[in-house]
Structures are given as structure tokens and as C-alpha cells.
Interface confidence: medium
């Protein structure tokens, strides 16, 4: 058993048929010694008396808010949550496996630049009685600070018969060094509580590996005289690290016909303009990637040819 | 060319070669197997390779103030990785494919280090630990890890030279 926060405790249970469970001793936080009784949740049934209560925690029915009273007055509470372990593996019932980039990916994170700011998100089908708490650090043996905000519900989607909820959190490294080569990864730890079930999820990454620039901005076409060619120009996204002479991007320019089956013409360039042939009913799209490290491409920015 | 006295390197040549190094480091990576480092449980054990750290003056302001600190750090790293790529980790069995970019990568590391420090000039080089003989069973994993960290190292070096070429060239 360990303390998650004040008056909230997590009991770690091996979860298998007829498991013996865990013996837990609760102590009433009071100077009183006599006339103390204990109850669980909203029940008025007295579970025991005395300053301590010993319980055998085996299942969710044994978890909940234990309260000690004296003469009708509440003295203190202890909320017990369960953390299940099956075959030596902690349960992952609360969050959905996003399966990208590999199986057992519950947390996904992205950064728009090298400032040390990043966003993580996760999915669940649970809509109520759900709380999240997020902590992060750079490295784990001698951790350096990363500050995370509160996790918020950022999207709702319908997937078949189910509703899916996306939660996200923003974090910022306290003393970020954008130009340095990272040697210790960022660690992100999410505590999830659904009713009386506790689970924790972790992710470890370098900022450089989760970089995904915003799409290029101000995408414009300029027809070239007496030609089917156009000059496409764009700018670095506002959110990208500066100076751009140091934090450089490379770009992919694509001409795509109306039909998905039509051949795509692609040009790669380090410049912020390119000359392409604009076909009727086609669109021109541009995306960006770090020039020197192959992290994710941005989403496409697009304009129609006409 | 960078000399110990502090004159400028050939920024544009260094930029071109460092960008080539980035391309080669990424093209070499698939040849050592698609493993996920994070599954190895040793994310914090990359202390066998040099890193360009916050105090090394490789940020835009540090380069403007005095690029020599950063260039020396990059030079040390290039020599270190050049030694690693020339060691039995890469030359021993299981043999690399004949057309592996690792040979080109090795030559380019040497080329860039020489651009930074031509013959006859000597920076203090970081003491390179004697490389323990690797065993075949370790090599695939070591190649992967070395190339992963090399990708990160050359990305920073390429940024330095791109910025230098754009803002510090005479």
C-alpha cells in the first residue's frame, strides 16, 4: 500500500481467483483514543471500533472511502483504490491502446518545436468518474523539472457504437535548451483513477523524436507568364523554433489531381518556394519536416490550382 | 578552416558535408534492424558517446560570441564516432551489406573532422576510451544504438554549420 495523495491510498493486488489479497491497517487521524467506529462509503454498518481498523483487501467491494467517527462526528477519511496486477502485469483497462507507433502505446506525445513544450494525449471509452494526474521529468535517476498542466477533455468521437474521449495535457521543460543534443529522455507519468480503480501509464521519449512542425503558412501560387507552371511560395510556421538559419526545415511539395488514383508529382526542397506544373482541378500541398533529423512531417497545407 | 588560434572554418563546405552526414546517418539506420531503443530498458545509458550539451556554445548566441568552443566539441564527437564506425562493432561479423552507407558515413566523418582541423593543428581531443572488443551477438544492437545517437549528434552539428554559413561566413 502507498499514498497517492493526502488520505488516498493505493493497494496493489495480485489479481487471480482465490488470491489472498492484502492486509491493510488503517489508522484514524485523531488524538482521540476511545469510542471510535469505522464505516465504508455511505453505509452506516459499523465495520470495527478502535483507533485502527485491520481489513483484508481482496476485491473492489473492499475498496472505497473508510471513515472513522466518534459520537456522530467524522474524524478522518481514508480512500482506498485498487491497482490490479494479473500475471505480473499491471492492468491497463482505463486507457485505449492507440497501437501507433507500436502496440501498447497508451500515451502519444508531440512537440511543435524545440522549446521544451510538448503535448500528450490519450483515449478512453469511459465518460464518468474519471480523473487524471500528470507528472513529468527529464531523466529518472536525477530528474530535471518539467511542469505539466491539468489534463483536459480535448475531443469526443463516435467510433461505431462507442463514444471515444480524448484527453490531453501540455507540459513545458523548466530549463529547456533547444540547441543541445538530448542525452536523457523526457519521462511522462499519468495516474488514472476510474471509480476505485487506479492505473498508471508512462512514456519515455526525446523531444527530437516527437517533433511535428505545424504546416507551412501563407501558401500562395503565382502563375508564370506563358506557361502552365506556377511558382508556389510559403513561409515557416509561426510556431517553429527560431532562428530559421539554425532550426531549418525541409519541404515536400505535392501536386494532387481530384482523383486519389491520379499520379502525384512530388518535389523536395529546402527553399520556401518551388516551381510546379498546375493541372486543371488539381491542388498543391506543402508539408514540412526538420531538415536534419527525420521526425514526423507536418500536416499538409493546401491550395487549389484554379 | 578552423585553427586553434580561432579563425573561421569553411562554413559552407562544413554545412554541405554535415548535411550529407545527416542523410547518410538516416540511410544507414534501417540496415541495422528495426529495434526500438526504448524496449531495451536503458534510455539513460548513453554515456558511452559524447553529446553536444547546453554549455558547449553551440546555440546561435554562443556561436556569435565564440564559435571555437562549439567547433572543438563537434570535432571531438566526429573523431569519437569515426573511431566507433572503424571499430570491430562495424567491421566485424555479422558483416554489413556490401553497399551499406556505413563506409561512406565513416569517410564523411573523417572528412568533416579534417575540415575542422587540418593536418598540423591540434585541438585538445577528448580522451576516447579504449573500445572493449565487441562480440558478434552485441554488434547489431550496438550498431543500432550508435547510429541512433549519431543521428542526433550530426543534426546539431548540421544546424551549427547551416547557421554559421548563413550568418558567420566572411
Amino acid at each position: 500500500i502507498w499514498e497517492l495523495k493526502k488520505d488516498v491510498y493505493v493497494v496493489e493486488l495480485d489479481w487471480y481467483p482465490d488470491a489472498p489479497g492484502e492486509m491493510v491497517v488503517l489508522t484514524c487521524d485523531t488524538p482521540e483514543e476511545d469510542g471510535i467506529t469505522w464505516t465504508l462509503d455511505q453505509s452506516s454498518e459499523v465495520l470495527g471500533s478502535g483507533k485502527t481498523l485491520t481489513i483484508q483487501v481482496k476485491e473492489f467491494g473492499d475498496a472505497g472511502q473508510y471513515t472513522c467517527h466518534k459520537g456522530g462526528e467524522v474524524l478522518s477519511h481514508s480512500l482506498l483504490l485498487l491497482h490490479k496486477k494479473e500475471d505480473g502485469i499491471w492492468s491497463t483497462d482505463i486507457l485505449k491502446d492507440q497501437k501507433e507507433p507500436k502496440n501498447k502505446t497508451f500515451l502519444r506525445c508531440e512537440a511543435k518545436n524545440y522549446s521544451g513544450r510538448f503535448t500528450c494525449w490519450w483515449l478512453t471509452t469511459i465518460s464518468t468518474d474519471l480523473t487524471f494526474s500528470v507528472k513529468s521529468s527529464r531523466g529518472s535517476s536525477d530528474p530535471q523539472g518539467v511542469t505539466c498542466g491539468a489534463a483536459t477533455l480535448s475531443a469526443e468521437r463516435v467510433r461505431g457504437d462507442n463514444k471515444e474521449y480524448e484527453y490531453s495535457v501540455e507540459c513545458q521543460e523548466d530549463s529547456a535548451c533547444p540547441a543541445a543534443e538530448e542525452s536523457l529522455p523526457i519521462e511522462v507519468m499519468v495516474d488514472a483513477v476510474h471509480k476505485l480503480k487506479y492505473e498508471n501509464y508512462t512514456s519515455s521519449f526525446f523531444i527530437r523524436d516527437i517533433i511535428k512542425p505545424d504546416p507551412p503558412k501563407n501558401l500562395q501560387l503565382k502563375p508564370l507568364k506563358n506557361s502552365r507552371q506556377v511558382e508556389v511560395s510559403w513561409e515557416y510556421p509561426d510556431t517553429w523554433s527560431t532562428p530559421h538559419s539554425y532550426f531549418s526545415l525541409t519541404f515536400c511539395v505535392q501536386v494532387q489531381g481530384k482523383s486519389k488514383r491520379e499520379k502525384k508529382d512530388r518535389v523536395f526542397t529546402d527553399k520556401t518556394s518551388a516551381t510546379v506544373i498546375c493541372r486543371k482541378n488539381a491542388s498543391i500541398s506543402v508539408r514540412a519536416q526538420d531538415r536534419y533529423y527525420s521526425s514526423s512531417w507536418s500536416e499538409w497545407a493546401s491550395v487549389p490550382c484554379s | 578552416r578552423a585553427v586553434p588560434g580561432g579563425s573561421s572554418p569553411a562554413w559552407t563546405q562544413c554545412q554541405q558535408l554535415s548535411q550529407k552526414l545527416c542523410t547518410l546517418a538516416w540511410s544507414a539506420h534501417p540496415l541495422v534492424g528495426h529495434m526500438d531503443l526504448r524496449e531495451e530498458g536503458d534510455e539513460e545509458t548513453t554515456n558511452d558517446v559524447p553529446h553536444i550539451q547546453c554549455g558547449d556554445g553551440c546555440d546561435p548566441q554562443g556561436l556569435r560570441d565564440n564559435s571555437q568552443f562549439c567547433l572543438q566539441r563537434i570535432h571531438q564527437g566526429l573523431i569519437f564516432y569515426e573511431k566507433l564506425l572503424g571499430s570491430d562493432i562495424f567491421t566485424g561479423e555479422p558483416s554489413l551489406l556490401p553497399d551499406s552507407p556505413v563506409g561512406q558515413l565513416h569517410a564523411s566523418l573523417l572528412g568533416l573532422s579534417q575540415l575542422l582541423q587540418p593536418e598540423g593543428h591540434h585541438w585538445e581531443t577528448q580522451q576516447i576510451p579504449s573500445l572493449s572488443p565487441s562480440q558478434p551477438w552485441q554488434r547489431l544492437l550496438l550498431r543500432f544504438k550508435i547510429l541512433r545517437s549519431l543521428q542526433a549528434f550530426v543534426a546539431v552539428a548540421a544546424r551549427v554549420f547551416a547557421h554559421g554559413a548563413a550568418t558567420l561566413s566572411p
Epitope: - | D48, S132, Q135, P136, L142
Partner: antibody, heavy 118, light 106 residues
Framework: EVQLLESGGGLVQPGGSLRLSCAAS????????MGWVRQAPGKGLEWVSG????????FYADSVKGRFTISRDNSKNTLYLQMNSLRAEDMAVYYC???????????WGQGTLVTVSS | DIQMTQSPGTLSVSPGERATLSCRAS??????LAWYQQRPGQAPRLLIY???TRATGIPARFSGSGSGTEFTLTISSLQSEDFAIYYC????????FGPGTKVDIK
């Protein structure tokens, strides 16, 4: 004389943790790859984990990846194996061994028994 | 991973006789092969490395041969202390041991 002495074994419940130590003497510890090999009761030998001389690179058998962590303290001439989320199939005698430059284990400790049972 | 197989599972030999133990790898391991002896209640002891090189202090009656996928450990004249289990191990890919051959007294 090369000596390797393991300690830290014992009885642990499934899902529990143990940390094994191996004190080395009689050779320059910081120059050698080191490893752990285990042997389940009445069974053969199974390589578990290995570590590079400086500790900078580590290697694991698939059966323990993500649960076990090998480390070393060259100043103390000591090798460690942190074992988490232990399972019944991890029950074995764990040997600490020095790895020769040929990939063979040229010196072995006497072993420490790890029992995983509820 | 490379699989190692050993034959026979048990070999019954009289003292003074010759014993020949086989080890086969599921793919070529070049000469990256070692042999170990393990007596009851003891830790394994390295006998042969690099397929044919005797380890320090190992008597000349032990010899190893082979390359690629087929390897042999020969004990030219068995002594009483040689009755034990013998394991082969490859170090070409992720380290794996053979299941062992038990040499007992006929």
C-alpha cells in the same frame, strides 16, 4: 584469483521485486563485459542480461526485457540485476559471470537462488 | 534467436573411454561457440571457446572442433571427475545455450 560473489536472492511473491548484487575481485572489473545467466531447477542454462564495460550499453533476453535492469558500479567492482514484476518462470539460480572477449563466460560465481512463489 | 541442439541427451561411458558430444546450431555461428562443464551443485566451468581453444587450466584430454553449424567436444579418456553435464553456447547472435548432454558412468 578471479572471484565473483552473488547475493540478494531469496523468496518473493509473484509481481514482486528483488535486486541481486555480484561483488567482483581479482581482475580489472571496469575492462570486462559482465553478464547474468540463470538456471531453473533441474533445467539448462539461460542467458539473462549483459552489460558493456562502462555500463553505457546493456543487453537483455526477450524473456526479461522491460522487467529486469542490469547495471554496474565500477568504483565498487559490483554488478547488479534489478528484477521487477517477477513471475513463477523467473525462479532459478542466478549466476554472475565475466564475459571474455570471445563471448564466452570465462568465470562464474556460485549463484544465488531466487524463489518466486505465493 | 539461434537454436542450439545437443546430442545425445545422455551418454553412458566407462572411465578411460573416449566421449564424443555433438552440438548443432540452427544457422551458422562461424566459430563463435563455447563448451562448459557443470558438476552437480556447482557453477558451470568454461572448457573451450572459439570452437577449439582450450580455456586456462583445462586438461589436454578436452578438445573442441567444428565450424558453422556442427561442433564436437571430445574427451579422449574420461576421468571420474569428468562425469557431469556439458553445455554448448553460441555467441554469434543473442547468446543461447544448448539443452546439455549428461555424461554418466556406464
Amino acid at each position: 584469483e578471479v572471484q565473483l560473489l552473488e547475493s540478494g536472492g531469496g523468496l518473493v511473491q509473484p509481481g514482486g521485486s528483488l535486486r541481486l548484487s555480484c561483488a567482483a575481485s581479482g581482475f580489472t572489473f571496469s575492462k570486462y563485459n559482465m553478464g547474468w545467466v540463470r538456471q531453473a531447477p533441474g533445467k539448462g542454462l539461460e542467458w539473462v542480461s549483459g552489460i558493456w564495460p562502462s555500463g553505457g550499453w546493456t543487453f537483455y533476453a526477450d524473456s526479461v526485457k522491460g522487467r529486469f535492469t542490469i547495471s554496474r558500479d565500477n568504483s565498487k567492482n559490483t554488478l547488479y540485476l534489478q528484477m521487477n514484476s517477477l513471475r513463477a518462470e523467473d525462479m532459478a539460480v542466478y549466476y554472475c559471470a565475466r564475459v571474455s572477449e570471445y563471448g564466452s563466460f570465462d568465470y562464474w560465481g556460485q549463484g544465488t537462488l531466487v524463489t518466486v512463489s505465493s | 534467436d539461434i537454436q542450439m541442439t545437443q546430442s545425445p541427451g545422455t551418454l553412458s561411458v566407462s572411465p578411460g573411454e573416449r566421449a564424443t558430444l555433438s552440438c548443432r546450431a540452427s544457422q551458422s555461428v562461424s566459430n563463435n561457440l563455447a563448451w562448459y562443464q557443470q558438476r552437480p551443485g556447482q557453477a558451470p566451468r568454461l572448457l573451450i571457446y572459439s570452437a577449439s581453444t582450450r580455456a586456462t587450466g583445462i586438461p589436454a584430454r578436452f578438445s573442441g572442433s567444428g565450424s558453422g553449424t556442427e561442433f564436437t567436444l571430445t574427451i579422449s579418456s574420461l576421468q571420474s571427475e569428468d562425469f557431469a553435464i556439458y553445455y554448448c553456447q553460441q555467441s554469434y547472435s543473442t547468446l543461447t545455450f544448448g539443452p546439455g548432454t549428461k555424461v554418466d558412468i556406464k
